[in-house]
Interface confidence: low
């Protein structure tokens, strides 16, 4: 392995992912790595020397820049939340703010709009399909012995509390909009009516 | 080569503010940070802060922080330093520097200093 | 910030004689990516800027005599003039550009005995 900065004949250095040629004196210089940016330029006898990203700005790659990209904040006017901070070698991780959802070009998402959910009535759920689709959601009710008891666009239908597990007796039975509710058992020999 | 050349000296009085200026020849002026050093009588250097044009953004040093106010404006490759509610202290020679490789190195051109002095 | 103590404060050497200024900066300023120490040294005569004389520690500034050079690693850091002339006669100061927040020494005040 050759050690930078290095003469070659084709202008292909050896590790293209951290090195590049530099033309003004024919040579394969080091790139710096990610969170670092050209701080002096490689020579002949010298090697790229690099330092890293001043506070606020960063370079997510290994790169032979000389300046650091600007951290941008996560736009709140466009939805968007911070879920991670800028730091010297990655931009802020953005995302929609709770109830908006993306809107995409060329694969971007660049802003965040409301989300147009319909909302499955108490006693339904939202049905699962492999697409994960915030929109057109199918609610279907819940099954034999579950209940859901929300509006809500992600709320699943729960099982029934089983009442004996507890140690309990049924007082009133569960529905697919309502839980069974459960009360002490009578005592022991108490005159049943 | 690079040259900086600072605004003149200034006589202030207690509270006021002072602005110097820092106009810059000879090198491209976005591409490295200028800072700003000052030096009271007889006493050490001390860096106040400093900009990098091309991110607009700059930094201060904790003792001076929220009463210096350093910008550059790129159309004149001129960069200043604002000093508010200035006290006898603050009476010192006024520098702009700034490095000859990329962004923020060792200061290797300085201007010709502005005096400042603060009196009642 | 970075805090960097220069000793002595004042130092007075016969002509010809060798001077040795010394720093210490309160935390490395070797960056371990290029193995580089991120310090200079200043030469400031009364009424004038400061001229640089020393950078990444022992790289001296063109046109600066070789009587000149900067040593050290790490947090310890040394200046020698090999040889001091009349014109040397100046104040000193180590500085350190390893954070965007430079800091300098106090000074070291080289007078001729």
């Known amino acids: 392995q050759l050690v930078p900065p290095y003469r070659i004949e084709n202008q292909t250095c050896w590790d293209q992912d951290k090195e590049y040629y530099e033309p003004m004196h024919d040579v394969c210089c080091s790139r710096c790595p990610p969170g670092e940016f050209v701080f002096a330029v490689c020579s002949r006898s010298q090697d790229t020397v690099c330092k890293t990203c001043p506070h606020n700005s960063y370079n997510e790659h290994w790169n032979h820049l000389s300046t650091c990209q600007l951290c941008r904040p996560c736009d709140i006017v466009l939805g968007f939340e911070e879920v991670a901070p800028c730091t010297s070698d990655r931009k802020a991780e953005c995302r929609c703010q709770p109830g908006m959802s993306c809107v995409y070009l060329d694969n971007e998402c660049v802003h965040c709009e409301e989300e147009r959910l319909v909302l499955c009535q108490p006693g339904t759920e939202a049905e699962v399909t492999d697409e994960i689709m915030d929109t057109d959601v199918n609610c279907v009710p819940c099954k034999p012995g579950h209940f859901q008891n929300t509006s809500s666009p992600r709320a699943r239908c729960q099982p029934h509390t089983r009442c004996e597990i507890q140690g309990l007796v049924e007082a009133a039975p569960g529905t697919s909009y309502s839980d069974t509710i459960c009360k002490n058992p009578p005592e022991p020999g108490a005159m049943l009516l | 080569q690079v040259q900086l050349v600072q605004s003149g000296a200034e006589v202030k009085k207690p509270g006021s503010s002072v602005k110097v200026s820092c106009k810059a020849s000879g090198g491209t002026f976005s591409s490295y940070a200028i800072s700003w050093v000052r030096q009271a009588p007889g006493q050490g250097l001390e860096w106040m802060g400093g900009?990098?044009?091309?991110?607009?953004?700059?930094n201060y040093a904790q003792k001076f922080q929220g009463r210096v106010t350093i910008t550059a404006d790129k159309s004149t490759s001129t960069a200043y330093m604002e000093l508010s509610s200035l006290r006898s202290e603050d009476t010192a020679v006024y520098y702009c520097?700034?490095?000859?490789?990329?962004?923020?190195?060792?200061?290797?051109?300085w201007g010709q200093g502005t005096t400042v002095t603060v009196s009642s | 910030d970075i805090v960097m103590t220069q000793s002595p404060d004042s130092l007075a050497v016969s002509l010809g004689e060798r001077a040795t200024i010394n720093c210490k900066s309160s935390q490395s300023v070797l960056y371990s990516s290029n193995n580089k120490n991120y310090l200079a040294w200043y030469q400031q005569k009364p009424g004038q800027p400061p001229k640089l004389l020393i950078y990444w520690a022992s790289t001296r500034e063109s046109g600066v005599p070789d009587r000149f050079s900067g040593s050290g690693s790490g947090t310890d850091f040394t200046l020698t003039i090999s040889s001091l002339q009349a014109e040397d006669v100046a104040v000193y100061y180590c500085s350190q550009y390893y954070t965007t927040h430079y800091t300098f020494g106090q000074g070291t005040k080289v007078e001729i005995k």
């Open positions: 900009i990098i044009p091309i991110f607009g953004t700059a």
């Open positions: 520097a700034r490095p000859s490789y990329y962004l923020d190195g060792w200061l290797d051109y």
